[in-house]
């Protein structure tokens, strides 16, 4: 049931996530994790914000939008096949067990093969279907039609092991509706 987003190896991937702050600057904590949203918190956290700022991030993961206006969309720089999988955006609004949780599926495709112009005729003669294009999901990309999709082994996450007991840290608090206030 996750929404699917696509990118090619070497590109930046974009995973959208938004909320509406009750008032300008009235921010709530958000965490991004690799793996579907567990019952509590984020598993395998890659980026985290608090009420004021981004307070934790790992290399290649950043917020490109204006997170102070509720744009907490994640950008992953220079993706590889290993970046494929489910990501959790968790909006942690104060309260009891009211997190807004969004699971987004990132599919990474191999980079397009761009043949050298002088070899074009030979290339297309040998591979007549190579220039077929196919559209994919929310972020449409072009792929080489005759190449099989890479069958990626799903990266194991905490997602399927909904934790009965939470980690004792401050980010398990809460969270609520996407519109705050």
């Amino acid at each position: 049931s996750e929404v699917e987003y696509r990118a090619e190896v070497g590109q930046n991937a974009y995973l959208p996530c938004f909320y509406t702050p009750a008032a300008p600057g009235n921010l709530v904590p958000v965490c991004w994790g690799k793996g579907a949203c567990p019952v509590f918190e984020c598993g395998n956290v890659v980026l985290r914000t608090d009420e004021r700022d981004v307070n934790y991030w790992t290399s290649r993961y950043w917020l490109n939008g204006d997170f102070r206006k509720g744009d907490v969309s994640l950008t992953i720089e220079n993706v590889t096949l290993a970046d494929s999988g489910i990501y959790c955006c968790r909006i942690q609004i104060p309260g009891i067990m009211n997190d807004e949780k969004f699971n987004l599926k990132l599919v990474i495709k191999p980079a397009k093969v761009t043949p050298a112009p002088t070899r074009q005729r030979d290339f297309t003669a040998a591979f007549p279907r190579m220039l077929t294009t196919r559209g994919h999901g929310p972020a449409e990309t072009q792929t080489l039609g005759s190449l099989p999709d890479i069958n990626l082994t799903q990266i194991s996450t905490l997602a399927n092991e909904l934790r009965d007991s939470r980690l004792a840290n401050d980010l398990r608090d809460s969270g609520a509706t996407i519109r705050i206030g």
């Epitope: 049931s1 579907a36 949203c37 019952v39 104060p94 309260g95 009891i96 067990m97 009211n98 997190d99 807004e100 949780k101 969004f102 699971n103 909904l162 009965d164 007991s165 939470r166 004792a168 398990r172 608090d173 809460s174 969270g175 609520a176 509706t177 996407i178 519109r179």
Partner: antibody, heavy 113, light 107 residues
């Protein structure tokens, strides 16, 4: 505005079954937890279980695990509690809640012959 | 399962009094404790979450404190509209468990 409206309560024979509905509105149904809680007449609150509509994950209180089943219909923004093998002691008001901050009004289930 | 022992089960106080209710968990719940107010025929209403954080819109006369296994809920100056039953809840782990409730009455 977040709203939860329960329905489906009423009189049930011992040994019977009942499916309660919880219609949600005013928020993104698939992204928030739903909890079910019940309260027998004159008694305290008892947590029944939890479901995340986004992926259908569930948790139950051990004493009701074999009797209660939680589910959702994302197209209808509705959560369901199915209760089987009902006994007199299952007579209670049943509440659904978005997280545990927004509650429905409750629906009364009476188990009696 | 985590047991929540709430006391007293009932209490009678006068308008303006300071009222205190306690909840003890059978193990450390890392301050993942909420307090609810329930009036007859109504759904519970969240007052406090994370042991000491007041829900927006709840009067400041309500407060919570505690850590580990021991938690306290206080009404600094009892008002007539505070007559209700109060429950604690631990949400540190499943199954979630409520205290038995404290019925508050006016003298």
């Amino acid at each position: 505005e977040v709203q939860l409206v329960e329905s489906g309560g009423g009189l049930v024979q011992p040994g019977g079954s009942l499916r309660l509905s919880c219609a949600a509105s005013g928020y993104t149904f698939t992204s928030s937890d739903i909890n079910w809680v019940r309260q027998a007449p004159g008694k305290g609150l008892v947590w029944i279980g939890w479901i995340f509509p986004g992926d259908g994950s569930t948790k139950y209180t051990p004493s009701l695990k074999d009797q209660a089943t939680l589910s959702t219909d994302k197209a209808k923004n509705t959560a369901y509690l199915q209760m089987n093998s009902l006994r007199a002691e299952d007579t209670a008001v049943y509440f659904c809640a978005r997280g545990l901050d927004y509650w429905g009004q409750g629906t009364l289930v009476t188990v009696s012959s | 399962d985590i047991q929540m022992t709430q006391s007293p089960s009932s209490l009678s106080a006068s308008v303006g009094d300071r009222v205190t209710i306690t909840c003890k968990a059978s193990q450390d719940i890392n301050s993942y404790l909420g307090w609810f107010q329930q009036k007859p025929g109504k759904a519970p209403k969240t007052l406090i979450y994370r042991a000491d954080r007041l829900v927006d819109g709840v009067p400041s006369r309500f407060s919570g404190s505690g850590s580990g296994q021991d938690y306290t809920f206080t009404i600094s100056s009892l008002q007539p509209e505070d007559i209700a039953t109060y429950y604690c809840l631990q949400y540190d782990e499943f199954p979630l468990t409520f205290g038995q409730g404290t019925k508050l009455e006016i003298k």
